[in-house]
Structures are given as structure tokens and as C-alpha cells.
């Protein structure tokens, strides 16, 4: 399977909400012995590869923000913890999954990574990520609403 990032850049005004999105592509085994774990974290653009660092988003780690289910089942983080930080991650039946960040500030600007881990009984994890950039702007040059820029190449790299 692969992870696609429909948009590589989100430019948003301060105070706005934004939903960052990734999509699980390709053959997805829906067997009883496979589980998909999806999560989000912040990173920085490394010289060699993106998403190599795993930093918290608004002090919440990837473990705090994870989604967990089989195949393309829907799931969402109903965690009070996430919502107290203005965050919510969710996924649908079609392989789309997202994180919504409310009331953006300039400190939210940076590189965001989605991570999908396929977990199989007695097999090593298969890990794939996608990356996108969020720019939060303020002042007269800031857009009135979020502007999104499509990815030139939507497929993520496979990191295992």
C-alpha cells in the first residue's frame, strides 16, 4: 500500500481551522490478522529524508493522536485530550484520514507527517508516511481562508 498527500502545502490565516489530509492507497488487506494504525506528528525537512523526526503536535505525541482499526473502517479520536488542544484526527471508509487543527497560530507553521503502520500477526510492521507543509500567516498578506496547493507527486515514499 501507499500513502498519498492530496495537498503538499496549506496556507492559512491565523485563527482559522485547517484539516490536513492523507489517503491510504493500493491493495489493503482486510483480513482478520491485519490492523492499520494511523497517526500524525510534526517534523522538519531533513537533508536526506522528510518525516525522520517525530515531534509532538501542540504537545500531543503520535501515540496520543493515533487511529486504530482494520482495513478501511472509519475511526476518529474522541479523546478529550486531543480536543482540549484543538485537535481531532479522523478517518473514513475510503482510506482518507485527517487531522483538524482549530484556531491556528503562527506556532503551528511547519512540516506535518501522517504515518500509516500495517500490523500483521508475527510479521514486522510495514510503515509508510506522507508529508505536507502548513504556513500560518498574519497581517495584510494573509489569505482570508485557507489556500491549498496540490501535490505534484501524490505518492509518499515507503520508509521501510
Amino acid at each position: 500500500f501507499k500513502v498519498a498527500t492530496p495537498y503538499s502545502l496549506y496556507v492559512c490565516p491565523e485563527g482559522q481551522n485547517v484539516t490536513l489530509t492523507c489517503r491510504l492507497l493500493g491493495p489493503v488487506d482486510k483480513g482478520h490478522d491485519v490492523t492499520f494504525y494511523k497517526t500524525w506528528y510534526r517534523s522538519s525537512r531533513g537533508e536526506v529524508q522528510t518525516c525522520s523526526e517525530a515531534r509532538p503536535i501542540r504537545n500531543l505525541t503520535a501515540a496520543d493522536l493515533h487511529l486504530h482499526h482494520g482495513g478501511h473502517q472509519a475511526a476518529n479520536t474522541s479523546h478529550d485530550l486531543a480536543q482540549r488542544h484543538g485537535l481531532e484526527s479522523a478517518s473514513d471508509h475510503h482510506g482518507n484520514f485527517s487531522i483538524t487543527m482549530r484556531n491556528l497560530t503562527l506556532l503551528d507553521s511547519g512540516l506535518y507527517c501522517c504515518l500509516v503502520v500495517e500490523i500483521r500477526h508475527h510479521h514486522s510492521e510495514h510503515r509508510v508516511h506522507g508529508a505536507m507543509e502548513l504556513q500560518v500567516q498574519t497581517g495584510k498578506d494573509a489569505p482570508s481562508n485557507c489556500v491549498v496547493y496540490p501535490s505534484s507527486s501524490q505518492d509518499s515514499e515507503n520508509i521501510t
Epitope: Y37, T39, A54, A63, H66
Partner: antibody
Framework: QLQLQESGPGLVKPSETLSLTCTVS??????????WGWIRQPPGKGLEWIGS???????YYNPSLKSRVTISVDTSKNQCSLKLNSVTTADTAVYYC???????????WGQGTLVTVSS | DIQMTQSPSSLSASVGDRVTITCRAS??????LAWYQQKPEKAPKSLIY???SLQSGVPSRFSGSGSGTDFTLTISSLQPEDFATYYC?????????FGQGTKLEIK
Amino acid sequence: QLQLQESGPGLVKPSETLSLTCTVSGGSISSSGYYWGWIRQPPGKGLEWIGSLYSSGYTYYNPSLKSRVTISVDTSKNQCSLKLNSVTTADTAVYYCARHPVAMNFDDWGQGTLVTVSS
Amino acid sequence: DIQMTQSPSSLSASVGDRVTITCRASQGISSWLAWYQQKPEKAPKSLIYAASSLQSGVPSRFSGSGSGTDFTLTISSLQPEDFATYYCQQYNSYPYTFGQGTKLEIK
């Protein structure tokens, strides 16, 4: 605050089965997105991963021990268990249980329990 | 299995020194590497994950770097409580493996 506590006999005879239990408090062992692992450390030596159990029951074992090890979970007691059969003196070690989120390292550890294999 | 090799195996240093410990993986592990600190008769404590991310509550004098096969743990200014044994661990693939440890002693 998550706490992990290992318990079990401190002395096991050669060829017998080592049985340890890890009791989790301050969190649920069935919480999705986590593995519960066992690591051991022979006296004066380094760390060796024994195996891990995923919250949904999937297990992963170190090939060097796979034929002798079983890790299981009892969600009603919030416990994870380790069984290692046919032990020898080389299995004398401090045994730790630890938690690690998916695609992450061991972030919470028990204090460890020393198991000596001796006749 | 992926072999993790730490160097040096032991190191003597003084309070205030800058110390670097290296860890090499026998094959590429991306950034799936952690560093732990262990004091005598205690369980290991996680310091660094994802090669360079600081575990919550760990002092900022600890830092990690590297990707692929070569990694380093740096303590910018040694404090008395930092004298301990340090281990690297790869969690790129099973079986998870640890380095043999680096014992940091007072000079």
C-alpha cells in the same frame, strides 16, 4: 501515571518454566496502539528484547527465543504474562516489562525482577 | 537481525564536559532509533526517540542525531546525575536490538 510491575518467582530450576506477570496500573492494557514487551538483562550485561504483544493480541518474538517463549494478555486483570520454558543458567537475568507505542520505542518500564536459574 | 554497535564501550569524563556516544546499525534503519540511560539497579529510561526527538521531561543537554546507519548521542555539558550506562536501540524491524552499552564514568 502509568505503572508496570513485574512479579513471579525469583528462583527457577533448570529445565523448568519461568513464569512472570506484568501488572499495569494507571492505564488499560487493551488500549489500542500499544505493544507490551519483555526485555531481559543478564547480570552485568546488556539488554535483550524477548518479545512484544500488541493490544489486539498479535505477538512478536525474538527468533533466538521463539521456540521457548509465550507472551499472553489477561485484559480482565490488566496483566501481561511471560512464559519461558526449558530454562538454563543462561536465562538468569533481570526481566523487565515495558510499553511501546506503535512505531515507537519503549517509553514506560517496570522496575524489573531478577530471576535466577539454579538447581 | 540488525546488529547495533556502540562506541566507545566505556568513557571517562568530567562534570561540564561535552560527550558524544556513537551507534552504528549493520543495515539502514531510517530514523527508528532510541537512546536509553540506565543507572545501577534501575530500569532503563528513554532519552531520545526517532534518532533526534527528545523524550518528554528529558533535559535539553541531551541531543541525538543521525539517520540510516550512523547515530550519535551528545550530552552538551555533563552533570553529576548523567554518569550511567547508555544504550541505543533500533525499532525499524523485528527483532528489536540494542547496542552493547556505553558506560560513562567520572574521571
